[in-house]
């Protein structure tokens, strides 16, 4: 092996006959936690105007909504479906969509996703037709 | 012959500037995404920057946002990436590397889809 071949490609080598591909990370939204307008629809955009490239190869994309008596806040980031989220597993990981699911929370109305193709949770969805209630 | 080549690395005091440089040839570079990557020294690889082949969208990771700036000129087939504000963990190699139409894959790292690297050492 040459001597300036990077090291430690570790999980993220695939094998193959070219002696492996290295998988590329996902392209996230990612402003954390953000004020919202996104209220009573069956889909929304995040409007956040920064899309990360993740830390990982194997991280994917995730947003949060969230709505309590003082506001309504969207969370967008890239996260290990692995890891819990917000005390959560993230469902639906390998979705190309990010399709809202409630959560059991005290004091507010949670929802989350997680999907895994570029952007995704720049478009988050809450319709009935995917999922069984939408916020309020 | 495809070929990647890294040039304008080298030693920088911290809060320094360098501009890295990636020539490519033997390949139609306005087809092909273009990343830069690092390796810092017992590290695995850190995806720095991407930058669309037309349209010149760029990406960054959340480390480096604000600081480094990857850009394309198509007409000499060469990828740049200037790096502000460096500091002592920004030390690493940096490759460039072209991503394979269509997929979230590049080829393995010692194939022609990634240069030699160059190296950058920041540090009083």
């Known amino acids: 092996i040459p001597p300036h071949v990077p090291k430690s490609v570790n999980s993220d080598v695939m094998a193959s006959d070219n002696g492996g591909a290295v998988k590329l990370p996902q392209l996230c939204k990612f402003c954390d936690v953000r004020l919202s307008t996104c209220d009573n629809q069956k889909s929304c955009m995040s409007n956040c105007s920064i899309t990360a490239i993740c830390e990982k190869p194997h991280e994917v994309c995730v947003a949060v909504w969230r709505k309590n008596d003082k506001n309504i806040t969207l969370e967008t980031v890239c996260h290990d479906p692995k890891l819990t989220y917000h005390g959560f597993t993230l469902e639906d990981a390998a979705s190309p969509k990010c399709v809202m699911k409630e959560k059991k929370r005290a004091g507010e109305t949670f929802f989350m996703c997680a999907c895994n193709m570029e952007e995704c949770n720049d478009y988050i969805i809450f319709s009935e037709e995917y999922t069984t209630s939408s916020p309020d | 012959e495809v070929q990647l080549l890294e040039s304008g690395g080298g030693l920088v005091q911290p809060g320094g500037s360098l501009r890295l440089s990636c020539t490519a040839s033997?390949?139609?570079?306005?087809?092909?995404r273009m990343w830069w990557v690092r390796q810092a020294p017992g590290k695995g690889l850190e995806w720095v920057s991407l930058i669309e082949p037309i349209g010149n969208r760029t990406y960054y990771a959340n480390s480096v946002r604000g600081r480094f700036t990857i850009s394309r000129d198509n007409s000499k087939n060469t990828l740049y990436l200037q790096m502000n504000s460096l500091r002592a963990e920004d030390t690493a190699v940096y490759y460039c590397?072209?991503?394979?139409?269509?997929?979230?894959?590049?080829?393995?790292?010692?194939?022609?889809?990634w240069g030699q690297g160059t190296q950058v050492t920041v540090s009083s």
């Open positions: 033997g390949f139609t570079f306005t087809e092909y």
């Open positions: 590397a072209k991503q394979i139409p269509g997929h979230m894959w590049t080829a393995n790292p010692r194939s022609d889809y």
